[in-house]
Interface confidence: low
């Protein structure tokens, strides 16, 4: 078949995968004239990863509350069993009726974009619904998502919200648009309007068309003991116990109080809708109870006291003191101050000792001076604020909060990497690679003790010597490792790691980077002795740096050869010695050569050794390098990429006979000649004319 | 009261589609998920997906996916549930159900499909 | 998806006694966000569609007879009847609205000795 380049550009070439993973297809280029040799394009193909998504996708949210989405919600898995980090939902369109947002980046008050399977576990990704200003019995959000893990093809989600009145909800005991009560004077009347009871939320829902149609009935279970209700002056009782919201709405409903006492007050009812002209229609309804709070005119409101935040740790529980919650009211005893939760944190809730396990939304102060009222910090390690209101049963409500830190109940300091000082400067910084903190999060306000300090540098903030110092500081890599004695490639410190009134210790090891250049190449030849030189190990640079001649120690290796001195001139007495040090003058003479040696006990083949060497220079530590080589068999048709100082036994047997091939030293200065002088003159011949040539 | 009143049954060949209407009355129509439920005879309920009426959103169980399809109506406040590629094993009893999110509280009488050459 | 199981197949009590029908999930259906079991029952009576009885494991939709008790967290549940009466004879069926496919148990029919 034939394929032009202009439908290859216009993508019109396509590749249909059958059969195995790897393979491809040749192809020939022709300008119709000329025609290229064969070409191979290679091929591999992947094995589709899939994503897909369990969980209900529906989210179920009592009006006006906040609501985490669960794996029972949302549950992504691919089918090549991808970390849930990686799985990423995108907000293709977010909610209408509320907000989603993040339980730990909730200060911007920006829309969430993205967010992690991962997250979705944690339970940090929230839902709020906000209450909107028309009354609704029953609504439904949707949030268009799209899921997506490369390589997989992305795929897209919907989740759908019910938010309704019909469910019982713990932060909303009502399931009335308000049922907020009623605050009168002691033997004075007052009225009640919606907005302080409201059921048009039941009217919502009937279709607007038919609202105007249906009305509210109101029955009254259980009267006022203390005071009458009355509807258009007319007083209610038991022959006639119903009031209509319309009647609500108009504000034809009072309530007079009989006088005699400041005690609590309040009625029963049963709220239903009601269909034209009376009749009963099927629809929501509830029963619950109106509360009247009766006020003595001449009281005092109670004042409340400064508060000091309470402090404890993930998963445990902390009594409530008067530290936190107090006033000052003469006229009421503790058991007749009411504080309510109007709003709880993410971060844990209140409980009752003998209450249930379960969150209270209502307490006296009797339940805090008694030790009763605690806080479960069963969140995450964050601040979080209750939002309460405190009531002496006599005054209206008053504003007051509750501020609960969380601190983590363990943390952990995270090490990713040592840290590398540069040969010549002696000196690095520190970074998060070194030192970060995390406990069930990111702890940027740690802060770090030295306990136990380097032995051979010091710890500098600003060029001064320090035994403490911050995450931030670290972070602006204002912490500086620097030797202060030149006589150890390596060196570790201890450090104690504070954060939120936790504690942890690391240690930090240091290590000397050298300052030199390795240049292995190519595979070098087994059985063959090439030159070491500065093509190969190089550290003039930090001889520069210095002003002084760098000297070589060989810690280990090489395992299959090794290291030797090679004579001068043949004049010079014995072979070469074996080296164990040796200097960056002596790389630069051409001085010194390795042996490569065959691995032994096995067959012949490509192998892998290396060189351990402490480079050592003055005034700054010594640092430790490896030179890493591949060898091989030696072939003669191979150019190598050193210069060769001897080839093995057999091959220079071989070099005698006239068609053998010869080595050459490509592309290095002083490679072998292409007719090399062991052929000739003999083994010292041959280093000559490679050496001096 | 809340009524969902289906269509009535019918016999269809193999091969053949079919469509099934509930009509919902009784409540407010987009405010509730509807769910199509069918029953082999003498067999048990197998869910066969939702449909929300509000924004026309469905959710299909996988062994229907690509046969089933979940309409809805608001102007009659009613719901259409297509199946395709009908084989004798579809002969059950469909029934639409109105749920709060996931449970059925309210049930269509039924209708009787029967599949057959 | 969940797969749900009930025992016995069936069962035969006197009037007046007390029915237990089990229902087993092959994964919690316990919602651990407000601490609910998303399990439902049902009675269906021949030539009718099914009736829902309980939901959330343990409530008792309106209008149900409180014979009709629900119990059980995480896998296993339980629905009893505590005082049989002529008009209970039927099929219960148990399912699971903790996530898509819901899921029915196979049924358990319930006769009058």
């Known amino acids: 078949r034939t394929r032009s380049g202009s439908q290859l550009d216009g993508g019109l070439v396509l590749f249909s995968h059958r059969g195995t993973l790897d393979g491809g297809f040749r192809f020939r280029l022709s300008d119709g004239e000329h025609t290229s040799p064969g070409h191979f394009f290679r091929v591999t193909a992947q094995k589709q990863v899939l994503l897909s998504l369990k969980g209900s996708q529906t989210l179920t949210v009592c009006p006006g509350s906040v609501q985490p989405l669960s794996s029972q919600t949302l549950r992504a898995s691919s089918s090549a069993g991808t970390d849930p980090q990686l799985l990423l939902y995108r907000v293709v369109r977010g909610p209408q009726l509320g907000r989603l947002f993040h339980a730990q980046q909730d200060s911007t008050g920006e829309a969430l974009v993205n967010f992690t399977q991962a997250e979705v576990y944690a339970g940090n990704i929230l839902y709020e619904h906000e209450m909107p200003p028309e009354p609704f019995w029953e609504a439904h959000d949707t949030l268009e998502l799209q899921l997506s893990s490369p390589p997989a093809r992305d795929v897209a989600a919907t989740l759908a919200v019910a938010v309704s009145f019909e469910a019982a909800c713990p932060q909303r005991p009502s399931h009335l648009w308000k049922n907020k009560g009623l605050w009168v004077p002691e033997g004075q009347r007052a009225r009640i309007t919606v907005a302080a009871l409201d059921a048009s939320n039941l009217l919502a829902s009937v279709p607007s068309p038919q609202r105007s149609e249906h009305d509210v009935l109101f029955q009254v279970t259980q009267f006022p003991s203390r005071g009458q209700l009355l509807v258009s002056e007319e007083p209610l009782h038991a022959g006639q116990p119903h009031f209509l919201q319309s009647q609500l709405a108009a504000g034809q409903l009072v309530y007079a109080h009989g006088g005699g006492g400041t005690q609590q007050d309040g009625f029963h009812f049963r709220a239903h809708l009601q269909g034209p002209a009376g009749a009963s229609v099927a629809g929501p309804q509830t029963s619950e109870a109106f509360a009247i709070t009766v006020r003595d005119v001449n009281e005092r409101p109670p004042q409340p006291q400064a508060s000091v935040p309470l402090r404890l740790t993930r998963g445990s529980r902390a009594p409530i003191s008067r530290a936190q919650l107090s006033v000052v009211d003469p006229d009421s005893a503790p058991g007749e101050i009411e504080y309510e939760v109007q709003r709880a944190p993410h971060n844990g809730f209140l409980s009752l000792v003998g209450g249930g396990l379960g969150p209270v939304t209502r307490f006296t102060q009797a339940d805090v001076d008694s030790g009763r009222l605690a806080f479960v910090a069963n969140g995450s390690s964050v601040a979080g604020i209750f939002q309460l209101s405190m009531s002496d049963g006599a005054s209206p409500p008053l504003p007051m909060s509750l501020a609960v830190d969380i601190l983590p109940s363990a943390i952990e300091v995270q090490l990713r990497a040592p840290l590398e000082v540069p040969q010549a400067l002696g000196r690095s910084s520190l970074s998060q690679q070194q030192l970060r903190v995390v406990s069930d999060r990111e702890e940027p306000e740690a802060a770090y003790r030295l306990i136990q300090g380097p032995q051979y540098g010091h710890l500098l903030v600003g060029g001064r010597p320090t035994s403490a110092f911050s995450q931030f500081q670290i972070d602006q890599g204002e912490v500086v490792f620097a030797f202060t004695n030149s006589s150890s490639s390596h060196d570790h410190f201890r450090v104690l790691a504070l954060a939120r009134g936790v504690n942890a210790s690391a240690v930090v090891n240091v290590t000397v980077r050298a300052l030199l250049h390795v240049w292995a190449g190519g595979p070098w030849p087994q059985g063959a002795t090439l030159r070491l030189d500065p093509t190969v190990l190089d550290a003039g640079e930090l001889a520069n740096r210095t002003d002084s001649v760098p000297r070589f120690r060989l810690l280990e290796g090489p395992r299959h050869g090794r290291v030797v001195r090679v004579p001068r001139a043949r004049t010079e007495p014995g072979g070469s010695q074996l080296v164990e040090q040796f200097t960056q003058q002596d790389l630069e003479d051409g001085r010194l050569g390795l042996e490569v040696g065959r691995p032994e006990g096995r067959a012949p083949g490509p192998a892998g050794d290396s060189l351990t060497l402490e480079l050592w220079a003055q005034g700054v530590p010594p640092a430790v390098a490896s030179l890493d080589f591949a060898t091989e068999p030696y072939n003669a048709a191979r150019p190598y990429s050193v210069a060769l100082l001897s080839v093995p036994e057999a091959a220079r047997t071989e070099a005698g006979k006239p068609e053998s091939s010869t080595p050459t030293g490509e592309p290095g200065p002083m490679a072998s000649s292409p007719e090399p002088a062991v052929a000739k003159g003999g083994f010292l011949s041959f280093l000559e004319a490679n050496m001096f040539s | 009261q809340v009524q969902l009143v289906q269509s009535g049954a019918e016999v269809k060949r193999p091969g053949a589609s079919m469509k099934v209407s509930c009509k919902a009355s009784g409540y407010t129509f987009t405010n509730y998920y509807i769910h199509w439920v069918r029953q082999a005879p003498g067999q048990g309920l197998e869910w066969m997906g939702w449909i929300n009426p509000n924004s026309g959103a469905t959710n299909y169980a996988q062994k229907f996916q690509g046969r089933v399809t979940m309409t809805r109506d608001t102007s009659t406040s009613t719901v259409y549930m297509e199946l395709s590629s009908l084989r004798s094993e579809d002969t059950a009893v469909y029934y639409c159900?109105?749920?709060?999110?996931?449970?059925?509280?309210?049930w269509g009488q039924g209708t009787l499909v029967t599949v057959s050459s | 998806d969940i797969v749900m199981t009930q025992s016995p197949d069936s069962l035969a009590v006197s009037l007046g006694e007390r029915a237990t029908i089990n229902c087993k999930s092959s994964q919690s259906v316990l919602n651990s966000s407000n601490n609910r079991n998303y399990l439902a029952w049902y009675q269906q009576k021949p030539g009718q569609p099914p009736k829902l009885l309980i939901y959330w494991a343990s409530t008792r939709e309106s209008g149900v007879p409180d014979r009709f008790s629900g119990s059980g967290s995480g896998t296993d549940f339980t629905l009893t009847i505590s005082g049989l009466q002529a008009e209970d004879v039927a099929v219960y069926y148990c399912q699971q609205h903790y996530s898509t496919p819901f899921t029915f148990g196979p049924g358990t029919k319930v006769d009058i000795k």
């Open positions: 159900a109105k749920s709060w999110v996931s449970w059925f509280a309210s």
